[in-house]
Amino acid sequence: LVPHLGDREKRDSVCPQGKYIHPQNNSICCTKCHKGTYLYNDCPGPGQDTDCRECESGSFTASENHLRHCLSCSKCRKEMGQVEISSCTVDRDTVCGCRKNQYRHYWSENLFQCFNCSLCLNGTVHLSCQEKQNTVCTCHAGFFLRENECVSCSNCKKSLECTKLCLPQIENVKGTEDSGTT
């Protein structure tokens, strides 16, 4: 199946690469603006220059385009622990990341929060912390894994998800009331 093309894609496909069709005159192909610039005025005729202007501070275009406005630079979400890796320039958006010994958890496709990598106290590092993944820990005997932290089996009750990991300890606890919460 042929993918459905939007009006802009249809118009652009009539012109060779790097050019776009004039919005008022479909017999004219204008040269697209370079990254870091935006379309101020369409070319007046065939073979004539497109009027492109450089993006103002706080805005950018990262590829050749015929946008009427530059895109606003992203701001790093400080409240989510993000830090600026590189500043926005006219041809590149802000790059945000996390500090050393932190990993990213994505709440949505483009929004992430920084969390500290687990140190695997009371356990051993099975897999090291990576950009988008916390350390994977293996816990020592008498401890169970809870949100990637090794927690003492004394915090485990019979009805909870830790019971299999703490089975010997649980069976040794007799006559204690189990509310199912910690």
Epitope: Y103, H105, K132, R146, E147
Partner: nanobody, 120 residues
């Protein structure tokens, strides 16, 4: 078995308010970050808000910041979403979800959802 049951949805006028509770069972509720996500008709899942296990840290999508408040009552194993100043674009099925930190977005453990309709 993890179970999450959302309720509180319904029809509300623009500018109105709703409170959505989510009852959790089958896991130690207070240990986990929880989140609300929503899905408008014909659209994908959109993250709305998240809260840490203790309730001390809360985060919001830009689209709901200042209007929605996430909270939890660990003694009742219940998560809440207070929605104020509702807009037509807030109409969606709202789901609560248990968060697995790292990577993401992952909303594998989520409830059946509750429908919020915003219309005059």
């Amino acid at each position: 078995e993890v179970q999450l049951l959302e309720s509180g949805g319904g029809l509300v006028q623009p500018g109105g308010s709703l409170r959505l509770p989510c009852a959790a069972s089958g896991f130690t509720f207070e240990w986990y970050w929880m989140t609300w996500v929503r899905q408008a008709p014909g659209k994908g899942l959109e993250w709305v808000s998240a809260i840490s296990g203790s309730g001390g840290s809360t985060y919001y999508a830009d689209s709901v910041k200042g209007r929605f408040t996430i909270s939890r009552d660990n003694s009742k194993n219940t998560l809440y979403l207070q929605m104020n100043s509702l807009r037509a674009e807030d109409a969606a099925v709202y789901y609560c979800a248990k968060v697995k930190l790292g990577g993401g977005p992952n909303f594998g453990y989520r409830g059946q959802g509750t429908l919020v309709t915003v219309s005059s």
